[in-house]
């Protein structure tokens, strides 16, 4: 009897694990084995697929094969007994495109009102994701064990802290990874649960803000109790995404160690140009608070978020406003390569009724104006970032008269 070739071959790739599954074509024939060959793009010869020769089941693992994961390959399978079936060819595929992201590893640490989450890829030193390790983002679902009401948190990194939790409460969570530039979203980790600790005697500092005065940064925060000492630490923001990096160490700001007030002042040259995280801790000599929520601190935005400069072209029923880069001293424009949004306030010169337009474009139309009427305009810039809301001061008001009727073109 002729052996039929197997059908419906499925290739499952999760991280660096390559699994093949197929259907037997003829269940009635016993003692059949199956073998695979593979072929790389641009080659004529077929090569035996190690790990998938003379298989008695309908599943095999060819993870040991060292493939270029970006190169297309083709597979074929046949059944073998005394004779062999014809080959069945599987559609060619590129391993990287087919690969799914496996569940990440998750390690939790509890504080009284926060949980620190350490996330790492499920496969250490993965070949599949070797070029993308730092591009992983993660999302999680967290719930109180007692209620089961889920909260989703998107767009987090390898080290994340969830704040504003209740003390002595068990929380459960699961995490999945994503490689968004390849449209890949992985599968969830197993559920991990942890109980937050008993409430700490000292709460962490709150409402941390950074401002610039002269050549210094001024860091301020709020605290519940008097007669405390505080310390401030900083970290390069990019290390959040690469906590395995040996540089992942929070460092002290020298002028902000053991300060007795709820602010500290340090020179701008303490930080090179870049993006940092800052955190503050309180102590009364005997007890220490947990660290505050981390704030993001961007030296360029802190130092140079200046009010926008704009020109107005007046028509009879509208203004066209053209926003340019703000000028530094010496009349050189400031290069702002972070995303900004513009708030434009305008009002009739004889009235206090202000109207507002918010726009991300740098050319804006202010509509529905009356002819031959003086209107005043001022503008400010805002950054668009979830962790860092920074606004410039308003520009000086500029007042212009609209043209007579019928000049709206």
């Amino acid at each position: 009897k002729n052996l039929k070739s197997p059908q419906k071959v499925e290739v499952d790739i999760i991280d660096d694990n390559f699994i093949l599954r197929w259907n037997r074509s003829d269940e009635s024939v016993g003692n059949v084995t199956f073998s695979f060959d593979y072929q790389k793009t641009g080659m004529d010869n077929w090569i035996k697929l190690s790990g998938c020769q003379n298989i008695t089941s309908t599943k095999c693992n060819f993870s040991s094969l060292k493939l270029n994961v970006y190169e297309e390959i083709k597979l074929r399978i046949r059944a073998e007994k005394e004779n062999t079936s014809s080959w069945y060819e599987v559609d060619s595929f590129t391993p990287f495109r087919k690969a799914q992201i496996g569940p990440p590893e998750v390690h939790l640490e509890a504080e009284d009102k926060a949980i620190v989450i350490h996330i790492s890829p499920g496969t250490k030193d993965s070949v599949m994701w070797a070029l993308d390790g730092l591009s992983f983002t993660y999302s999680l679902v967290i719930w109180k064990n007692s209620s089961g009401v889920e909260e989703r948190i998107e767009n987090i990194y390898s080290r994340h802290k969830i704040y504003k939790l209740s003390p002595e409460t068990t929380y459960c969570l699961k995490v999945k990874a994503a490689l968004l530039t390849s449209w890949k979203i992985g599968v969830y980790s197993p559920v991990h649960c942890i109980k937050t600790t008993v409430e700490n005697e000292l709460p962490p500092p709150e409402n941390i803000e950074v401002s610039v005065q002269n050549q210094n940064y001024v860091l301020k925060w709020d605290y519940t109790y008097a007669n405390m000492t505080f310390q401030v630490q900083w970290l390069h923001a990019f290390l959040k995404r690469n906590p395995g990096n040996h540089l992942y160490k929070w460092k002290q700001i020298p002028d902000c160690e053991n300060v007795k007030t709820t602010q500290c002042v340090f020179p701008q040259n303490v930080f090179q140009k870049g993006i940092y995280l800052l955190r503050v801790q309180a102590s009364d000599g005997n007890n220490t608070s947990f660290w505050s929520e981390e704030i993001k601190f961007d030296t360029e935005i802190q130092a140079f978020l200046l009010p926008p400069v704009f020109n107005i072209r007046s028509l009879s029923d509208s203004f066209h406003i053209y926003i340019g880069a703000p000028k530094q001293s010496g009349n050189t424009p400031v290069i702002q390569d972070y995303p900004l949004i513009y708030e434009i306030i305008f009002w009739e010169n004889t009235s206090n009724a202000e109207r507002k337009i918010i726009e991300k474009k740098t050319d804006v139309t202010v509509p529905n104006l009356k002819p031959l009427t003086v209107y005043c305009v001022k503008a400010r810039a805002h950054t668009m970032d979830e962790k860092l809301n920074k606004s410039s001061v308003f520009s000086d008001a500029v007042c212009e008269k609209t043209k007579p009727g019928n000049t709206s073109k």
């Epitope: 730092l134 591009s135 983002t137 998107e154 767009n155 990194y157 994503a178 968004l180 530039t181 449209w183 390069h236 923001a237 990019f238 995404r241 690469n242 140009k273 870049g274 993006i275 360029e300 390569d337 972070y338 995303p339 949004i341 991300k360 668009m384 970032d385």
Partner: nanobody, 126 residues
């Protein structure tokens, strides 16, 4: 904040067609691309199709040749034309925008984030 509004879902017979739309409003400064994912009951959310800021398209193997993704940049809208629908295409379809924080100013500082729509139900009956 970005809002994504999907529409076009519904009940259709096997072999039929649907066209999903997703309009993005709000501020997306450096969009990488827009795409569609789907989630069937009891299953993980899976990628369906994506189109990046140029015209590069990506499709899941299961929908290749049947589904077509397109986008209208002027309207900030992405479409998914679904033909030859099968019962296994039944799922909630989610629109997604992937964006980045723009030109990196410091080492390793380009990150990618995703915004999700609320989802639209597609049911294919046999």
């Amino acid at each position: 904040q970005v809002q994504l509004q999907e529409s076009g879902g519904g009940l259709v017979q096997a072999g039929g067609s649907l066209r999903l739309s997703c309009a993005a409003s709000g501020y997306i400064f450096y969009p990488f691309g827009m795409g569609w994912y789907r989630q069937a009951p009891g299953k993980e959310r899976e990628f369906v199709a994506g189109i990046n800021d140029g015209t590069t398209t990506n499709y899941a193997d299961s929908v290749k040749g049947r589904f077509t993704i397109s986008r209208d940049n002027a309207k900030n809208t992405v479409y998914l034309q679904m033909n030859s629908l099968k019962p296994e295409d039944t799922a909630v379809y989610y629109c997604a925008v992937v964006y980045t924080n723009g030109p990196a100013r410091t080492r390793g500082d380009n990150y990618y984030h995703i915004y999700w729509g609320q989802g639209t139900q597609v049911t294919v009956s046999s």
